[in-house]
Structure formats: C-alpha cells, structure tokens
Interface confidence: low
C-alpha cells in the first residue's frame, strides 16, 4: 500500500492586499479516512485557518466541493488578504479517531502579501543653512510588503549619491517601513531647487511614488551690502543709499545709524523676486550736511532672518561743504521709505 502524500505544489504564493489567495493542496489517497485541516505556522503555537467539519471561517472557502465523493482536492481560497495574513500555511491530514490524530503535513506554502507603500513624506532640516553647507532631508514610507523596495533621491532631476537608507525590520514582519536620509550641499542658486524622494515597489506596477521638499525651506542666502553717496543736492542734503542684494528669505530688518545713533528702522515686505528666487532692497537716507560741524559716520545695519547684524559704514565729509552759522541741531532725518527701485 502506497504511503499517503499531502501535496502542496507551491512553495510560495504572493498576493496583493485586498485580493484573494488560493492555497493548493491535494492528497494522493482517500485512505485512511479522516479530515484535512489548514494551519498557519507549525509547532504547538500554530493557528487553525480552516476546518471543514467545525468552526466559523468567514474568509476561507474550499476551492472544490469537499463533500463530494472521492474528493482529493483540499485547496482553499482566503478572501480580502491583508499583510497580517502573511506566513507559511500547512495542509494537514488527520486520521479519524477520538480524537483525530495528525497523520501527515504538506511541505507548506509561504504566503507573502503585496501591500503598497504609503506616500513618501519628505522632511527637511529644522533650521536653515547657508550655501556650501550640507543639509539632510529624510524620506519615510510605511506599510509595504514584500520587503524589497527601491528608493532614489533627486535634486532638480539629478540623482543624489550621498544617501543612507534602512528598511525595518530586518527580520520577518507583516509589513515594512523605509527611512532614507539624503545629504545635500547647498548653493546660493538653490532657492528654487527641489529634492524628490522616489519609491519603487512591486505593488506600484512601474509607477513610483514621490515625495518632494523645496530647498527654499532649508536655505538662507545672506545679503550683500553696499552703501553709496549720491551727489550733493542744492539744498545741502546728501542722499546715501544702502543696497541690500541677493538675500533669502525675505525676513529682513534694516537700521540706519548716524554716528552710532539709531536714525530709522525699516522692515522688508512685499518684495518682488529676482529670477533666482532671492530679493533685493534699496533704502535711502537724506543727511542735512549743513547741520553738522564734523564728518558724519552713517551705518547701514541689516539683520537677516534672525542672524547677527551685518554693518556697512560710510563717512559723509562735512568739511567739504559750507556750514550754516549757529546750527547745532542733530542731523535732520528726512529719509523716505521708498523701497526696491531697480
């Protein structure tokens, strides 16, 4: 008499989350009499998946009619698969008795569940950095299975190489997460730059998911300062200009000091953008030369994006201009608040 064989032809089956999985099992003989049961896992902790005779298994249905005479096909279909269903399933033959005795197990079929990764979320540095500095961007995606996944970083369409990626856990799990960090060296031209995290997975059928971050959130472009004197006006007033150029972000405060004393403070707002995303700003101060006996030291002081103030000074030569007799008043501030003349 030939020994009973329990045949599970597939070593592994891969199913998309939400689909049905068919687990095949046939027996080589109708003898001895006894039921077939399906389990997930082996050993004492195994989980009963299907038992024709008793129990309620709403998601499991037999592929063929198990009640028909001479049935030797005990394949099952599990509906609405989730990542939690992953594991190795065993078709086990029992000999009828009180209780039934386990006789033979199939070799097992590994069910892996294909679950889509979540949309990648890209986060940048907590504080801004200036050009030539390196900043890190992090990309995370979760809930995918199987574990195989590809993640690439791009900056303005060019793939980045300074990347470190981890998929967790390393061991068996119903689903996985990926976390990747890309290091990007900033340049002054990066205000309009973008980094993209691209995730490719078998469940996405060649259409990768993308997460993006704008380098404008990570970069600070400090301003250039230039202070110049316009020609003397007929009314003995000198127009001094402070040009603040190529800065980002817009958050900027400008203070004029005359001989160290605050003359006027202005805040930048509603500035038009340069092509590269930076901003320019021009501020004027009118100095009444006739009101001063000595040269006037004018300082343009700029505080940009909460950084320490940057100063640029200029001396107006009073000695070169005739003075009004008996005048000892402070320099008259008639400076306008006009901005951004290009």
């Amino acid at each position: 008499e030939e020994e009973l064989q329990v045949i599970q032809p597939e070593k592994s089956v891969s199913v998309a989350a939400g689909d049905s999985a068919t687990l095949n099992c046939t027996v080589s003989s109708l003898i001895p009499v006894g039921p077939i049961q399906w389990f997930r896992g082996a050993g004492p902790g195994r989980e009963l998946i299907y038992n024709l005779k008793e129990g309620h298994f709403p998601r499991v249905t037999p592929v063929s009619d198990p009640t028909k005479r001479n049935n030797m096909d005990f394949s099952i279909r599990i509906s609405n698969i989730t990542p939690a269903d992953a594991g190795t399933y065993y078709c086990v033959k029992f000999r009828k008795g009180s209780p039934d005795v386990e006789l033979k197990s199939g070799a097992g079929t590994e069910l892996s569940v294909r679950a889509k990764p979540s949309a990648p979320v890209v986060s940048g540095p907590a504080v801004r950095a200036t050009a030539e500095h390196t900043v890190s961007f992090t990309c995370e995606s979760h809930g995918f299975s199987p574990r195989d996944i590809t993640l690439k970083w791009f900056k303005n369409g060019n793939e980045l190489s300074d990347v470190q990626t981890n998929v967790d856990p390393a061991g068996k799990s119903v689903s996985y997460s990926i976390r990747s960090t890309a290091r990007v060296v900033l340049t002054r031209r990066d205000v309009h730059s973008q980094v993209i995290c691209e995730v490719a997975h078998v469940t996405l059928q060649g259409d990768p998911l993308r997460g993006t971050a704008n380098l404008s959130e990570a970069i600070r472009v400090p301003p250039f300062l230039e202070v110049t004197q316009q020609s003397m006006r007929a009314d003995n007033q000198v127009n001094v200009t402070c040009q603040v150029t190529k800065f980002y972000p817009q958050r900027l405060q400008l203070t004029w000091l005359e001989n160290g004393n605050v003359s006027r403070t202005e805040m930048a707002s509603a500035l038009p953008e340069n092509k590269d995303g930076t901003y320019n700003w021009t501020s004027w101060l009118l100095v009444n030369v006739s009101a001063h006996r000595d040269d006037v030291k004018l300082t343009c002081q700029v505080e940009h994006d909460g950084q320490p103030a940057v100063n640029k000074s200029f001396s107006v030569k009073v000695s070169a201009h005739p003075k009004e007799q008996g005048s000892n008043t402070a320099a008259e501030n008639t400076g306008t608040n006009e901005r951004n003349i290009y």
């Epitope: 896992g41 892996s112 856990p169 061991g171 068996k172």
Partner: antibody, heavy 121, light 107 residues
Amino acid sequence: EVQVLESGGGLVQPGGSLRLSCAASGFTFSSYAMSWVRQAPGKGLEWVSAISGSGSSTHYADSVKGRFTISRDNSKNTLYLQMNSLRAEDTAVYYCAAYSGSYYYYGMDVWGQGTTVTVSS
Amino acid sequence: EIVMTQSPATLSVSPGERATLSCRASQSVSSNLAWYQQKSGQAPRLLIYGASTRATGIPARFSGSGSGTEFTLTISSLQSEDFAGYYCQQYNNWPYTFGQGTKLEIK
C-alpha cells in the same frame, strides 16, 4: 529536486581576486533570497552576504564590506560572489544557501555542498 | 553588530536522553532566530526558524523556544544521527550573525 551547486573556488594569492558561482535548480530562483556563508577550517559558520530575490537589496558582513560583491542573474538561475583584495583570513569553505522566502526570513533551508577558497602565497 | 553566544561549547549526552542547547543575543532579536545542524564534512541543515517553528522534514524531537535575547534548542530523545554541531543565527539586524556553535557528542 531543489538544489544549489557552488563552483569557482581555488588557490589564490593574497590581494588577488576570485569569483564564485552558484547554480540553482528545482525552484523559482527569482522568488528566493540567496546568501553566502563561509566556514574557516575547524571554525564555525560565518554569514558573509545576502541578496534579495529581485537583486535590488544586498547586505554584507563587516569583515568583507567593500571587498566582496554579491550579485545574481535570474535569467541564468545563478548567484555570484566577486571577491577582491583577498586575505589569508578569507580562507574557508564557501556555501551558497537559499532563504525560504524572497525577503530573508525564516532562515536558509537549501544549502550547497560548498566550494573551497584558499588564500596563500 | 549583534553577538550571539552559545553554551556550552561542547555537550556530552547519552543516546535517548534530552539535550538542551542555549543561545544568547547581545540585544533583542525578537523571534528572528534560526537553528542549524551541521554534521562533519556536510553542509548545514535548517532545523528551526522563527525561534520555535520546525523546518520542513525536521523530526518532532527537535523544538525551539525563547524570544528577545534568550533561546533554547531542545532535542527530547537523542538519536545517534543527532550528534553533530549546532549553530544559532539571528536575522533581526544586519549583519546577520551566527553563534560560535555547540558540539553535541556521545557520552
């Protein structure tokens, strides 16, 4: 019959290179992660490297990182281990093994008989 | 990397008796642990995966237990073919690492 068969071992001088191959048969090669494990004479097992079923993910032991490269050709059902800058301590029997899934879980349930690599001047 | 430590290095047991082999991880590896048997001159054979699940074709006298950092392989009634080397291996963190092995010999 499910089996894997290693080849490519031999005697090589320190600093030299060698490429090991592992031919698989009897199973859907691309569905299974593969690994190289070595065993120095009289010593225990040392995990060397692993590659996922698709080949998109690879991992290495610290002792071989930067010197060894694992790869696979699923169209030829073959696994490779390119070994460069070989050292005397790389002398061992190198086993090819298949994981029981495509993603490194469960352990390695199919093993070859091994190929011997000797690094000596 | 995670260091796996097996004890004892050598275990002498009589046929028919129970053998208990231990494996300790330097940090938690959850249940991601496998046991292998290796006979002299042969390739290793997978016995247990997932810390406690027997691989296909492995006799019921082999059982694994434990999780986290402490694991045990028990052979309930030793047969002559069971005298061999035994290795644990964690597959929770890269790089995967083996224990140094336990040699099971006839007493």
